[in-house]
Amino acid sequence: HNTTVFQGVAGQSLQVSCPYDSMKHWGRRKAWCRQLGEKGPCQRVVSTHNLWLLSFLRRWNGSTAITDDTLGGTLTITLRNLQPHDAGLYQCQSLHGSEADTLRKVLVEVLADPLDHRDAGDLWFPGESESFEDAHVEHSISRSLLEGEIPFPPTS
């Protein structure tokens, strides 16, 4: 999988789209997970509705939402109130049983708020760009949503 880069601005919302073959993935729930290192299981940030027919309903986990257009074949993830620590490597996944297929690898880049001059460098406009990642990326793990929360069980 190539890695698609999405740029967002701190404090704003970022929408990430993951297109897929609607026939091939018919009846499958979808998920969004974050990779926090080169190794580790892909731990879920948020997944679509338990009832596949209701996948169009937006589901939230903290500041992250997911909704699935199962006919059009587009999974959409919204990251609200984007923060620098939301940057990173993510995956859109299609679930079947205990397995998960990667639909898209996504790199979220968080740019400093142009109205906040404390740390800002030269700012780019947010958008989407393709980058060709040959690097071997296998696994992922997730993060605690808020500093101080007790996160997922550690894996190694």
């Epitope: 620590h85 990173g88 500093e147």
Partner: antibody
Amino acid sequence: EVQLLESGGGLVQPGGSLRLSCAASGFTFSNYYMAWVRQAPGKGLEWVASLTNSGGSTYYADSVKGRFTLSRDNSKNTLYLQMNSLRAEDTAVYYCTREWAGSGYFDYWGQGTLVTVSS
Amino acid sequence: DIQMTQSPSSLSASVGDRVTMTCKASQNVGNNLAWYQQKPGKAPKLLLYYTSNRFTGVPSRFSGSGSGTDFTLTISSVQPEDFATYYCQRIYNSPWTFGQGTKLELK
């Protein structure tokens, strides 16, 4: 194999300038945040600055803000640190590192380049 | 800024010993901690991230635990190549701050 190779260190007088470079190979450079971490002689580690994968935003430690400028050239797989108004307390080994985006830990490090600020 | 304090500052051990070193944060940092190993004249190497996740190629004798403000790095059976200085780092929310280090020496 991920490799980071720093260059540009040396002796400079207080108030002077220096530009460090870091040549990266073994990974898709444009998909990774990068950073510099320094270590004063006989001391611990100090994060200096970080840069997003496109170079769109930079973040600096308070100790260098306004004096150091971090940039990158993704077409050349190279990271730069422009250091101006150097002070004696900037004397350190400067390490180029690959930062895991959004997490702020450094998974690969260069061998370091020594910057000495002295009259 | 959150301060990271490591103890002890130095530690003597023999090959085969089980050793532990600690890192204390001045405020709750959840599980947002990394550990590095540094040998004299060399660059640091990442050992663990998010408290307990071993980085690629790190031997299983290295393990991490803790959450909130108190963290521990354990080497279950010290090997000759493990004598080095170990640093903890607060991660996930900047500024990224390091502890002052624990030096593991041969007894």
